[in-house]
Interface confidence: medium
């Protein structure tokens, strides 16, 4: 039934595939990069604009005419912290996730020329100005460099780096993909006199290889080898260096200085997982065990006279979890204040949600400064008087995002301002703080358009709009759009949240087909209140499908006993949670139950396919996109968080009791489409050329697609429509669906 | 099903106050606001404030600001107002209603309404 | 405070006829939500979020707008639809309402 009648009144069109595939309607976004405590940059029809945040006047910084002469297309830019220089991005090749190369000039703002002599070289890492001045340190062949001035040589600061075996100032695959979320290892002192490293050394790490196809022309498929250390495989080891970039010196090579892990780290396997400084001469760290339930955070300081740095045991602070992990994914970053003797931080309380507790270096306890049955998602920005932080804890909603501020001296005295600022159109707020807090951004993601907005925080005034989508309302007025529901049912006495794209002209008396739209992994969530458009509203609009998600066990958010429900156990209760939604969803009386369909990619490939092959009876078909098949071929650091280690000793049964495989005879009750690309150096197509393979030894009819050379995004252009339209095609036949 | 109750008519003196009772059932009560609402004799709607059974927060207008007061009982389910003060000027039917989160959200449930009529 | 203006006041069509209510607000809302209310019974959502038919409401209804200028449109009148109409709005406190367009039938 695909509610004709209300369709053929409505004379709008409905958003279609291709306006998907398209992006025929753009959200517009308003990204500004804060240059100080009251200006910042912002990026007009190629013109680097300067604003002033009080009055909203600006002036041309850069005229997008200046490098017109340059004979290279700018991929990005980044202006030195004193304005003098702008660091010019091209050449840029993407390695992985955050990962890539590029090129890299270097032009002179007061002479207005480029600088010409002792260049960076070409397929530079990484590349980060000082945080005052401008200093610059970058990464070149696993090896880290300093500039003191942009024109003068570098000074080297390591000897070491070797391709996938030594990194200095740049992290391995799995650091990169799992600790960091960044290419980046180098961390300089906030007065730019110090820079921090990791090095890390993959000799003994396995590596994965997969075939990369190239042109038609290359006869012989290239090998792709890449360190990736599967579950219970061997681990990177990593080392922590901080060197004096005051004391650089042309004749002798640069002394870096090691800071060591605590001993209670050395006796085993270890990460690093966070680095902040928390004065000139002060740094954090913190350590995480492989068995990822015990941290400990260093704060050393450095001891002029010796040139090393100190790190006390009585200033450690153990962080230790008992019924799961330790942070949402690692650790949380400690926000020092200004003298660096205290810091607040955001970690479990008694009853296992996530809030913000304030330490001081010399004591071990902490003391909480918000409480509840809500989490803090993130401290945004501290100053003498007050911190701001982000929270989920407005009207008791998981999904929504709000931004508040709490006295420094008087923890009771707390405020919301971004609540009732726009309480219909914005529920899910992100922040941008000037230099020093004077002025922040406000970006509101939904339930309605996306809003930029400017404020004072001084007085948290509103200052102006800076984006409104109007342009785009008015498009979006004359097409039949879905209308998104969150609420939540209730299974065992919990609180558990869904959302629902709605078809246009949604009637609960009439019969709908529901795709359950999965990810389900630890600490994800679905249900929220940001305004999309996506997949799902195509399916929704045009093919008047509900695109429904669920968080079930393991979500986030939502403290730990629903978060560490899944510890040492994937792909049990997370599973079964979304088959018990489908069935919810089944009974509200507008689902027709014959047509209930799921898809997931990555994690939400792997549900959708234990889903699957449960042989629950309730979902007719799915389609697992670059899915895990088995917690053995996936990355230690994610999967021991969750799993432990693959031993006897450990939790070796439940790895065996996870796959996908062990599934297959249950995929005869179910149609079943299974995509992956081929050079995915994430989620291995290893992972479904196993399933397809214990699918053909059980005589399961199934469908199939591989996406050649394709990584874990399917982002291409070309391959990122056909996997959509393909999909489409697939969910269509299988609702029997014109 | 998803449904406010609310208490009978109430007539009332001049000065006296009255306190007006909205009972919901069919859904979790402390999840959602509950709005109350004024239609004076044959005229149109005026909001007063929402409560948040989950924690108990209040918005009011500020026009009802020391005229009405907003409690819930999450025991029973029932959200109060209380209208303190009372003149000719507060005969109305008052209304409650659930604020529910679909998109930017609406009033989906209304209770039938108690008439308050203020008489000497 | 936003003030929401409804036209007109009152008004009768004959069945089959086309009828537009418009609410126009003092200053930009985000969305507009209708709702319909017959002599003594509560009010009765019909359109939430600017254009999305509130379950049970004929496809002969709709509703559209931006910015300050919003309205709903029955594309033929029949009977049952003789009722007031208000138009809310709730992008800035306090909430508000329109004051009500009556919609009689010929």
């Known amino acids: 039934n695909k509610g004709t009648d209300d369709a053929t009144a409505d004379s709008r069109k409905t958003y279609t595939l291709t306006d998907y595939l398209k992006n025929t309607y753009r959200l517009k976004l308003y990204s500004l990069r804060w240059i100080s405590d009251h200006e910042y940059l912002y990026k007009q029809e190629n013109n680097i604009l300067v604003f002033n945040a009080e009055y909203g006047n600006s002036s041309v910084f850069l005229e997008n005419s200046t490098f017109d002469e340059f004979g290279h297309s700018i991929n990005d830019y980044s202006i030195s912290p004193d304005g003098q220089f702008i660091l010019l991005e091209y050449n840029y090749v993407k390695q992985w996730r955050h990962s890539y190369t590029a090129s890299y000039d270097i032009y002179d703002l007061n002479k207005r020329q480029l600088i010409t002599e002792e260049r960076i070289p070409n397929n530079t890492q990484w590349v980060t100005w000082s945080p005052v001045g401008h200093k610059l340190a970058y990464v070149w062949n696993n090896d880290i460099y300093v500039k003191i001035e942009p024109n003068l040589p570098s000074y080297r600061i390591t000897w070491t780096g070797k391709e996938d075996i030594i990194y200095n100032g740049i992290t391995d695959w799995v650091y990169e993909e799992e600790v960091f979320s960044a290419y980046s290892a180098l961390w300089w002192s906030p007065n730019g006199t110090f820079l921090a490293y990791a090095q890390f050394n993959d000799t003994e790490v396995p590596l994965i290889e997969y075939s990369f196809y190239s042109d038609e022309s290359l006869q012989y498929p290239k090998t792709v080898r890449v360190p990736y250390p599967k579950a219970g495989a061997v681990n990177p080891t990593v080392k922590f260096f901080v060197v004096n970039t005051d004391s650089l010196s042309s004749v002798t090579n640069a002394t870096s200085i090691q800071i060591t892990a605590p001993a209670s780290m050395l006796i085993g396997d270890h990460y690093l997982c966070d680095v902040t400084w928390a004065t000139q001469e002060r740094i954090s760290l913190q350590w995480l065990r492989r068995i990822q339930n015990y941290s400990v955070m260093d704060i050393c300081d450095y001891d002029e006279s010796s040139g090393r740095w100190n790190c006390l045991v009585a200033r450690q602070h153990i962080e230790m979890s008992t019924t799961g992990w330790v942070g949402r994914f690692r650790p949380s970053e400690p926000h020092f204040t200004l003298d660096g003797n205290s810091f607040y931080k955001i970690i479990s309380n008694e009853e296992g949600y996530r809030h913000i507790c304030y330490f001081q270096i010399d004591k071990k306890d902490c003391t909480f400064i918000t409480k509840g049955t809500w989490e803090v998602i993130g401290i945004e920005a501290l100053t003498s008087d007050y911190l701001y932080y982000i929270s989920n804890e407005y009207k008791g909603m998981p999904g929504g995002r709000n931004l508040y501020k709490i006295q420094l001296s008087d923890y009771t005295k707390v405020t919301c301002l971004s609540c009732e600022l726009n309480p219909e159109r914005c529920q899910y707020y992100s922040v941008s703080f000037s230099k020093e807090a004077k002025y922040y951004q406000l970006r509101c993601s939904g339930p309605g358009l996306p809003l930029y907005t400017l404020h004072s925080s001084v007085n948290d005034k509103g200052l102006r709009v800076l984006e409104d989508n109007s342009a785009l309302d008015k498009m979006l007025q004359n097409v039949q759009m879905p209308s998104k529901k969150l609420d939540f049912i209730i299974l065992n006495e919990t609180k558990f949240w869904y959302q629902m794209i709605l078809p246009p002209h949604f009637d609960k008396s009439k019969k709908y087909p529901l795709l359950l739209d999965v990810y389900a992994g630890p600490c994800s969530q679905k249900a929220d209140t940001v305004f999309r458009l996506n997949w799902a509203t195509y399916l929704a609009s045009t093919e008047n499908i509900i695109v429904a998600s669920f968080d079930g066990r393991g979500s986030g958010y939502q403290g730990d006993k629903i978060m560490h429900a899944i510890n040492r156990r994937l792909g049990t209760f997370e599973v079964e949670d979304q088959i018990e939604a489908a069935r919810q969803f089944s009974k509200m009386g507008f689902v027709d139950n014959k047509r209930i369909a799921i898809w997931g990619w990555s994690y939400g490939g792997y549900v959708t396919s234990m889903v699957l092959g449960s042989g629950s009876g309730v979902f007719k078909c799915g389609i697992a996109v670059a899915p895990v098949s088995r917690w053995e071929y996936y990355d230690s650091v994610y999967t021991e968080r969750y799993m432990g280690l693959p031993t006897p000793e450990d939790n070796l049964d439940h790895y065996r009791n996870s796959t996908v495989m062990s599934r297959a005879e249950n995929f005869k009750q179910v149609e079943y489409l299974l995509i992956h690309g081929t050079a995915d150096d994430n989620v291995h197509f290893q992972q479904s050329a196993q399933i397809s393979k214990a699918l053909v030894d059980v005589g399961v009819d199934f469908q199939a697609m591989w996406y050649t050379d394709e990584d874990h995004g399917i982002a291409s252009s070309t391959a990122h429509q056909h996997i959509y339209t393909h999909m489409s095609h697939f969910i269509k036949q299988c609702f029997s669906l014109p | 099903e998803v449904q406010g109750v609310e208490s009978g008519a109430e007539l009332v003196k001049p000065g006296a106050s009255v306190k007006l009772s909205c009972k919901a059932s069919?859904?979790?009560?402390?999840?959602?606001?509950i709005n109350w609402v004024r239609q004076r004799p044959e005229q149109g709607l005026e909001w007063i404030g929402w409560i948040f059974p989950g924690d108990g927060s209040t918005k009011y207008n500020e026009k009802f600001k020391g005229k009405a007061t907003l409690t819930t009982d999450k025991s029973s389910s029932t959200a109060y107002m209380q209208l303190s003060r009372l003149t000719s000027e507060d005969s109305a039917v008052y209304f409650c209603?659930?604020?529910?989160?679909?998109?930017?959200?609406?009033?989906?449930?209304w209770g039938a309404g108690t008439t308050v009529t203020v008489s000497s | 405070q936003i003030v929401l203006t409804q036209s007109p006041a009152i008004m009768s069509a004959s069945p089959g006829e086309k009828v537009t209510i418009t609410c126009s607000a003092s200053s930009s809302v985000s969305y507009m939500n209708w709702f319909q209310q017959k002599p003594g019974t509560s009010p009765k959502l019909w359109i939430y979020s600017t254009s999305n038919l509130a379950s049970g409401v004929p496809a002969r209804f709709s509703g559209s707008g931006s910015g300050t200028s919003y309205s709903l449109t029955i594309s033929r009148m029949e009977a049952e639809d003789a009722a007031t109409y208000y138009c809310q709005q709730r992008s800035s406190y306090p909430n508000t309402f329109g004051g009500g367009t009556k919609l009689e039938i010929k």
């Open positions: 069919g859904y979790t009560f402390r999840s959602y606001d």
């Open positions: 209603a659930r604020w529910t989160v679909v998109g930017p959200g609406y009033f989906d449930v």
